[in-house]
Interface confidence: low
Amino acid sequence: CKAMHVAQPAVVLASSRGIASFVCEYASPGKATEVRVTVLRQADSQVTEVCAATYMMGNELTFLDDSICTGTSSGNQVNLTIQGLRAMDTGLYICKVELMYPPPYYLGIGNGTQIYVIDPEPCPDSDF
């Protein structure tokens, strides 16, 4: 397993609708045709997998139907969007990139993006 550099923003604030987007960029040492991107969430020293997608270079990035993530790829950049976030989901979201094919296998793990989620205040009833 060979190491690879992965860059991602340090901090992102989710929108009032609970959507957070960030770019995950990897320094590809070779011409990979198959790439796997995994988003991990680290909170209270526990790491859980949020979502994962395997895609062919040049094709759309397709997350599974059960996933809260969507994304697009462009060259060595992956634009990730996580939906349905609530305040309790605030945490460090780590981008892990694997170059699956062809060999050799490369693995890169970013330093993480701290996503802050603030639940919107409920709107007061109004008489319009």
Partner: antibody
Framework: EVQLVQSGAELKKPGASVKMSCKAS????????MDWVRQAHGKGLEWIGN????????SYNQKFKGRATLTVDKSSSTAYMELRSLRSDDTAVYYC?????????????WGQGTLVTVSS | EIVLTQSPATLSLSPGERATLSCSAS?????MHWFQQKPGKAPKLWIY???ILASGVPARFSGSGSGTDYTLTISRLEAEDFATYYC?????????FGQGTKLEIK
């Protein structure tokens, strides 16, 4: 009515290859990924991989990477799976099954299965 | 890879009894999906997205759970319910199935 009709049983020798088909009808073939799942006799279900008939992009279970190849023929709405370097433990029923999307349940439609027997 | 462990492997009950089938995931999954399979037949989607009954599935079936622990429950067993049930996750590749729970007549 959605239907997936698979090719007939195959008897192969160890080291050989097998290519099976899955003909889809009753829906737009390019709108849904096609997955392949196998089941050895008396055993559980094992996912092999899937293919997007539109882009022809594939995702494989690493266990089958390099041995299985998924392809499609859009003109005939048919998906194919080839498995190479067959071993006795590849003896199983191989199913094609249709992915879903945000509005349709995944794996709601299955082919009848293709029995592959690997024996010398 | 997310490993799904089903328990028990075999469940022997009589018609009219309540059945509880469990599926435990090695890491958190978004939803669990369940399939019913009878000998010599292809699997049938039975419950999807944890708790939604597939078309034609009787209301005596229900699904629940979250995170790593999920359950399929049959409130009152009928003869046609005796089969093997598999859980499945589609949260991350590779898609994986549990090893199955065989529900047999006592």
């Amino acid at each position: 009515e959605v239907q997936l009709v698979q090719s007939g049983a195959e008897l192969k020798k160890p080291g050989a290859s097998v290519k099976m088909s899955c003909k889809a009808s009753g829906y737009t073939f390019t709108d849904y990924n096609m997955d392949w799942v196998r089941q050895a006799h008396g055993k559980g279900l094992e996912w092999i991989g899937n293919i997007n008939p539109n882009s022809e992009s594939t995702s494989y279970n690493q266990k089958f990477k390099g041995r299985a190849t998924l392809t499609v023929d859009k003109s005939s709405s048919t998906a194919y799976m080839e498995l190479r370097s067959l071993r006795s433990d590849d003896t199983a029923v191989y199913y094609c099954t249709r992915d879903g999307n945000r509005y349709d349940a995944w794996f709601a439609y299955w082919g009848q299965g293709t029995l592959v027997t690997v024996s010398s | 890879e997310i490993v799904l462990t089903q328990s028990p492997a075999t469940l022997s009950l009589s018609p009219g009894e309540r059945a509880t089938l469990s599926c435990s995931a090695s890491s958190s999954v978004t939803y669990m999906h369940w399939f019913q399979q009878k000998p010599g037949k292809a699997p049938k989607l039975w419950i999807y997205s944890t708790s939604i009954l597939a078309s034609g599935v009787p209301a005596r079936f229900s699904g629940s759970g979250s995170g790593t622990d999920y359950t399929l429950t049959i409130s009152r067993l009928e003869a046609e319910d005796f089969a093997t049930y598999y859980c499945q996750q589609r949260t991350s590749y590779p898609l994986t199935f549990g090893q199955g729970t065989k529900l047999e007549i006592k």
